[in-house]
Amino acid sequence: AHYNTEILKSIDNEWRKTQCMPREVCIDVGKEFGVATNTFFKPPCVSVYRCGGCCNSEGLQCMNTSTSYLSKTLFEITVPLSQGPKPVTISFANHTSCRCMSKLDVYRQVHSIIRR
Amino acid sequence: AHYNTEILKSIDNEWRKTQCMPREVCIDVGKEFGVATNTFFKPPCVSVYRCGGCCNSEGLQCMNTSTSYLSKTLFEITVPLSQGPKPVTISFANHTSCRCMSKLDVYRQVHSIIRR
């Protein structure tokens, strides 16, 4: 089949824009650390890089292959307010490189870490 | 309480970076349209803008207040492969502005649309 060059160019552009790579995302701090329901953070979210995007096949998953850690200082508020906001320093995982990995390999990797 | 200027500056930066606004995201086309499990798209994902980020309170939700539509041509593949990839044209909702809205208002809005 012969396809229009413009269509092929735009499809190629879509492939590039959606590939598996570190992407800036908003992390809800309370949810990330599973804190008590009466503990709040200001700001409630932080911006970090996490692997995201799409892989070329159903059996592949976009996973981080290297991680750095970013230290951020936020205010922690506990209600009822017996004292003012307390500064807390939190270290966040920041994905620096990613790869499309077989879901089976990911499963094995996770389970070998758990088994250790 | 007196807080270090550096801390306040970095917190302000975090607020700005994580605010509710249109963000570039990857949409898995098959999941978005809930198609049959033997229908695949190449590329499998497209890049569009959707509202995201955090609101200042639990009771608020980041919602789109205006939407444009982006037309993209992809290839659809049905397995088993009895014929080649077929072009499909998809108009994707692309959020152009966002606002933190009360979850109750969002619920009312959605249900008034459904009730119409």
């Epitope: - | 978005e32 349209f33 809930g34 939407t67 539509y69 998809i90 108009s91 909702a93 459904i114």
Partner: nanobody, 118 residues
Framework: QLQLVESGGGLVQPGGSLRLSCAAS????????MGWYRQAPGKQRELVAA???????LYADSVKGRFTISRDNAKNTVYLQMNSLKPEDTAVYYC????????????WGQGTQVTVSS
């Protein structure tokens, strides 16, 4: 039990129009996505058109500009307006509805026959 009921199929001359409809009974929630597939004799089932509650729409290039998909959330119904019908549009048309959630589910209609012939 959730059921999808299609109607509107039939015999039509080339260049004519038909409007298919598909209604879901047994669900109080509106599906996230709704759409239509078709299957011609001896051929694979192919995607024709689809729509999401977020306003996105999809059309196979073979029907683009001739077919229009629309939905009525209040009635949990999806429509396919088919204009300028061609003999190659002859097929059984199946609607589907997709509910999102922790366990996404698809439901299918029983199919409605569309025949384009002079």
């Amino acid at each position: 039990q959730l059921q999808l009921v299609e109607s509107g199929g039939g015999l039509v001359q080339p260049g004519g129009s038909l409007r298919l409809s598909c209604a879901a009974s047994g669900s109080s929630f509106s599906p996230y996505a709704m759409g239509w597939y078709r299957q011609a004799p001896g051929k694979q089932r192919e995607l024709v058109a689809a729509t999401t509650s977020g306003g996105s729409t999809l059309y196979a290039d073979s029907v683009k500009g001739r077919f229009t998909i629309s939905r009525d959330n209040a009635k949990n119904t999806v429509y396919l307006q088919m204009n300028s019908l061609k003999p190659e549009d002859t097929a059984v048309y199946y609607c589907y509805m997709h509910w999102r959630g922790s366990d996404p589910e698809n439901y299918w209609g029983q199919g409605t026959q569309v025949t384009v012939s002079s």
